[in-house]
């Protein structure tokens, strides 16, 4: 079995303020078991945007039905985008454990926000 890869196909995405941004992410294997998390930024100061395992993320919805068998699509939609949402978003696979541990990250998708036309 090939080792899991995290694929973020879009290097960048541009969205108008007030609209929703779709950030694409797929994984290439069901192994290892464990959740997906999305972060804005990298390093210790990165901001958690979505955690499949736990938490409340009212602006985030999953694009596919992530509970369904053999699902490998962990794309998300973030609603009501503002300029403060600009940054690079990383889709990160975690490995099940106590606690779950980071396994592999996607390359990132840079989100830029266009001003609303007047």
């Amino acid at each position: 079995e090939e080792e899991l890869q995290v694929i973020q196909p879009d290097k960048s995405v541009s969205v108008a303020a007030g609209e929703s941004a779709i950030l694409h992410c797929t994984v290439t294997s069901l192994i290892p078991v464990g959740p997906i998390q999305w972060f804005r930024g990298a390093g210790p100061a990165r901001e958690l945007i979505y955690n499949q395992k736990e938490g409340h993320f009212p602006r985030v919805t999953t694009v596919s039905e992530s509970t369904k068998r053999e699902n490998m699509d962990f794309s998300i939609s973030i609603s009501n985008i503002t300029p403060a949402d600009a940054g690079t978003y990383y889709c990160v696979k975690f490995r099940k454990g106590s606690p779950d541990t980071e396994f592999k990250s996607g390359a990132g998708t840079e989100l830029s926000v266009r001003g609303k036309p007047s």
Epitope: L30, V33, K96
Partner: antibody, heavy 119, light 110 residues
Framework: QVQLVQSGAEVKKPGASVKVSCKAS????????INWVRQAPGQGLEWIAM????????HYNQIFKDRATLTTDTSTSTAYMELRSLRSDDTAVYYC????????????WGRGTLVTVSS | DIVLTQSPDSLAVSLGERATINCRAS??????????IFWYQQKPGQPPKLLIY???NRDSGVPDRFSGSGSGTDFTLTISSLQAEDVAVYYC????????FGQGTKLEIK
């Protein structure tokens, strides 16, 4: 950490119904399937059914299709398994178990609920 | 329906020796490039514990003396060096279709 806390032991008469609960914590309840499995005294494991709390999709073992009903209450992160028309051979420990990988497997288990059916 | 048959029904192995438990499926459990077989350990008075998923992948925290192998219809759980705490009943389960379990194998110390 993931925890599944099941309701207490039950004693029922033949022909009655029982409803076992399984309260989940430590994870987003709607993101993972819940399975129900039973084990008669001194016997092996028998899969009953599974439910996706996000949309209440269910799959049942044909043996239990007419007597078992799975439900969830997402407001309390609780899953329920009701078994009707109980017989003495339904005496068993009933387990709930969470499927962490959507593989139709059982990663985290409750401690079990003993249901005794006796006249 | 796919039926899983474990062998042997019971097994006695000396401490430090290898224990091997087999699970045969009545038809192939391979699909989408995966073998949909899982192994569980159950000690008396406890719920089962997942050991191996998708035939050969150790679950988190499972000692590396446990390994799973096989493909298609024939699968094996191996304990490379039996420890006292490994005394338990072991079950295989498939999810190629809706789940079913094997009948279990009781492992004891010789």
């Amino acid at each position: 950490q993931v925890q599944l806390v099941q309701s207490g032991a039950e004693v029922k008469k033949p022909g009655a119904s029982v409803k076992v609960s399984c309260k989940a914590s430590g994870y987003t309840f709607t993101n993972y399937w819940i399975n129900w499995v039973r084990q008669a005294p001194g016997q092996g494991l028998e899969w009953i059914a599974m439910i996706d709390p996000s949309d209440s999709e269910t799959h049942y073992n044909q043996i239990f299709k007419d007597r078992a009903t799975l439900t969830t209450d997402t407001s309390t992160s609780t899953a329920y398994m009701e078994l009707r028309s109980l017989r003495s051979d339904d005496t068993a420990v009933y387990y709930c178990a969470m499927d962490y990988g959507s593989l139709y497997a059982m990663d985290y288990w409750g401690r079990g609920t003993l249901v005794t059916v006796s006249s | 329906d796919i039926v899983l048959t474990q062998s042997p029904d019971s097994l006695a192995v000396s401490l430090g020796e290898r224990a091997t438990i087999n699970c045969r499926a009545s038809q192939s459990v391979r699909s989408s490039g995966y073998n949909w077989i899982f192994w569980y350990q159950q000690k008396p008075g406890q719920p089962p514990k997942l050991l191996i998923y998708l035939a050969s992948n150790r679950d988190s925290g499972v000692p590396d003396r446990f390994s799973g192998s096989g493909s298609g219809t024939d699968f094996t759980l191996t304990i490379s060096s039996l420890q006292a705490e490994d005394v338990a009943v072991y079950y295989c389960q498939h999810s190629r279709e809706l789940p079913t379990f094997g009948q279990g194998t009781k492992l004891e110390i010789k």
